[in-house]
């Protein structure tokens, strides 16, 4: 008799794929024309990335460091009107993209939380949550919570409001902290909070260190749902050497939890790579005309247009990974097991019941390596086969779909492999 199927876990929408942050509307749209009406026209692009949520803003009125001139209920007219926002929500909903609003109060100022008036600001946030939930947003983000006195209790209160409206709404908190204890203490009082931090960027970027960071994090947070990013707001290129970008994309999409990216991560956009750009919000490179001030500053392979036409580009890899992440049970909610492999490597398996299983092998090193996969430390339910099919490699030159012998597996420098193999009873 066939074995019984394992019961599927409850899946919230943010469990099903990546979140995409647009912290600066103008920089994202380029040509100084960034507003909500224009963003509506970019939703097809977001759909093509198969992201599940858009983390937007802040958009509210905020006069730098002035509490009295900060109104979390009002959209800054430079971004558009409330009705523009409503129309964006409707269009996004039709494309199955959820919209999360960043309500970090003093986003134009020095201290994002007006440190001297925390209580009055916290009350403003409470009112804003109620207001924007009524308006149809799917969740909220607040950043720099390490600068918020008594952050845990405020977050608990805000989460209660958000979840009280609907269990389907999400609260994201961001911190610059990379300290695991601090992160765990913030998570403890909030059962469904998604926390973005600098935890993974506090790394020597070796396979062993990354493996230890990931396993420590998962052990410390127990069976709660995680999010994975390198920071609460920045671009991957600000934290990673260029040669590891593809590897990290593969890792973020295949770890158990929600991957969170910033606009431009999918094309390897660099902070301040072009003259005169602000470090925190570089202009999105849609095509070669995205930076008209300096002719020739942008080459085609740096742009969305150029990379869309190149199957070997970072953008094409992002789309492939996002597609796999959103449709494969083992990647959606599968169990996660790391196992021993060669030095410099980080390898793990994702599996769910009788569904196709996925093997991820990441070479963080500068030299080619034998995988040296040792399945002895895997549980019986997750044993390795002798061969697995290649879903994708982060490097060109391998034929997708080809079977690879795991015992003889070799990886190029900085290569990551995503392999699949069937469940065998």
């Amino acid at each position: 008799r066939a074995p019984r199927c394992r019961e599927l876990p409850a899946q919230k929408w943010w469990h099903t794929g990546a979140l995409y942050r647009i912290g600066d509307l103008q920089a994202f749209q380029g040509h100084g024309s960034g507003n909500l009406a224009g963003l509506k026209g970019r939703l097809d692009y977001l759909s093509s990335l198969k992201v599940k949520g858009l983390v937007l803003g802040p958009l509210h009125k905020n006069q730098k460091d002035d509490v009295a001139q900060t109104d979390l209920l009002q959209i800054d007219p430079n971004f558009g009107s409330k009705e523009d926002f409503d129309n964006l929500l409707q269009s996004a909903k039709k494309k199955s993209i959820r919209v999360i609003l960043d309500l970090t109060p003093n986003y134009r100022g020095e201290n994002l939380w007006f440190s001297t008036q925390v209580d009055s600001v916290a009350t403003k946030v409470k009112d804003a949550l109620e207001f924007w939930l009524q308006a149809g947003v799917d969740g909220f983000q607040v950043r720099d919570i390490e600068n918020l006195k008594d952050a845990s209790s405020f977050l608990a209160e805000w989460e209660n409001i958000t979840k009280g409206f609907s269990e389907d709404r999400l609260l994201i908190a961001g911190t610059n902290s990379s300290d695991l204890q601090q992160i765990v203490s913030l998570l403890e009082s909030n059962k469904d909070l998604l926390l973005t931090s600098s935890y993974l960027s506090d790394s020597s970027f070796t396979g062993e260190h990354t493996k230890s960071l990931v396993t420590q994090y998962l052990n410390a947070t127990g069976n709660r749902w995680c999010s994975w990013s390198l920071s609460q707001a920045g671009l991957l290129t600000s934290f990673l050497p260029a040669q590891l970008l593809r590897l990290y994309q593969l890792m973020l999409f295949t770890l158990p939890g929600t991957p969170v990216f910033s606009y431009g991560d999918e094309i390897g956009l660099k902070a301040a790579a072009l003259p005169g750009q602000p470090v925190e919000a570089p202009v999105m490179l849609w095509d070669e005309s995205s930076f008209p001030d300096i002719p020739g500053a942008v080459s085609a392979n740096m742009t969305v247009k150029g990379q869309s036409e190149d199957p070997g580009s970072l953008l094409s890899l992002f789309r492939q990974l996002s597609d796999q992440r959103s449709k494969e049970r083992s990647l959606l909610h599968g169990d996660f097991h790391t196992f021993s492999s060669g030095p410099g490597l980080f390898s793990y398996i994702r599996h769910w019941d009788q569904n196709e299983r996925f093997l991820v092998v990441l070479n963080f090193g500068d030299v080619g390596l034998s995988a040296g996969l040792q399945a002895s430390d895997l549980p019986a339910s997750a044993s390795l086969p002798t061969k697995a099919d290649l879903v994708l490699s982060t490097q060109p030159g391998r034929e997708e779909g080809s079977p690879l012998e795991l015992e003889r597996l070799k990886l190029e420098p900085h290569e990551g492999l995503l392999l699949r193999f069937p469940y065998v009873a």
Partner: antibody, heavy 120, light 107 residues
Framework: QVQLQQSGAELAKPGASLKMSCKAS????????IHWVKQRPGQDLEWIGY????????DSNQKFKDKATLTADKSSNTAYMQLSSLTSEDSAVYYC?????????????WGQGTLVTVSA | DIQMTQTTSSLSASLGDRVTISCRAS??????LNWYQQKPDGTVKLLIY???RLHSGVPSRFSGSGSGADYSLTISNLQQEDIATYFC?????????FGGGTKLEIE
């Protein structure tokens, strides 16, 4: 509270133009578009178009593209609709309306209507 | 353009009755369906938005339901002040369009 106050009834000759107004109060004028809706006697409602007072951007029903011109004056919180080349088909009540504070497109606030009669 | 059809143009009912008015769209409108009440003096009020959500200040005897292309408005305990014409409107796609209206009268 939110109010939309429309200008009074108009009698106009065929071929002429006229401009009606809709003065908004009780909210920040630039936050919401002003929509215009037509209703001929004993008939259903027809959406004409909207103006975004914040940017002056307009979008309208193809059917009214050459008939209605929408403008707004932020300083007086007033939206205007000008109808040109009037014919008896333009005799109707014209309403201005505004969305509510929720994302589904629906008109939560309506003016009292301006009756336009086109007659020689 | 999306066509909105209210098949019943007028309806007679007694006070206290439960009355249902239907509306059909020419295509799926993803629940972006609103109901309005127009009194004989021309005053227009929003009753229901997004298929089933009651606008603030509207009595709970009004309710809405439906999905895809078919929607309905129900008045559960008809009152004298409910005598009016009821219009449906789709907010799914520009241009927004309205149904022809259903005039409700007391028997």
């Amino acid at each position: 509270q939110v109010q939309l106050q429309q200008s009074g009834a108009e009698l106009a000759k065929p071929g002429a133009s006229l401009k009606m107004s809709c003065k908004a109060s009780g909210y920040t004028f630039t936050d919401y578009y002003i929509h215009w809706v037509k209703q001929r006697p004993g008939q259903d409602l027809e959406w004409i178009g909207y103006i975004n007072p914040n940017s002056a951007y307009t979008d309208s029903n193809q059917k009214f593209k050459d008939k209605a011109t929408l403008t707004a004056d932020k300083s007086s919180n007033t939206a205007y609709m000008q109808l040109s080349s009037l014919t008896s088909e333009d005799s109707a009540v014209y309403y201005c309306a505004r969305k509510g504070h929720f994302y589904a497109p629906s008109f939560a606030y309506w003016g009292q209507g301006t009756l336009v009669t086109v007659s020689a | 353009d999306i066509q909105m059809t209210q098949t019943t143009s007028s309806l007679s009912a007694s006070l206290g009755d439960r009355v249902t008015i239907s509306c059909r769209a020419s295509q799926d409108i993803s629940n972006y369906l609103n109901w309005y009440q127009q009194k004989p003096d021309g005053t227009v009020k929003l009753l229901i938005y997004y298929t089933s959500r009651l606008h603030s200040g509207v009595p709970s005897r009004f309710s809405g339901s439906g999905s895809g292309a078919d929607y309905s408005l129900t008045i559960s305990n008809l009152q004298q002040e409910d005598i009016a014409t009821y219009f449906c409107q789709q907010g799914d796609t520009l241009p927004y369009t309205f149904g022809g209206g259903t005039k409700l009268e007391i028997e």
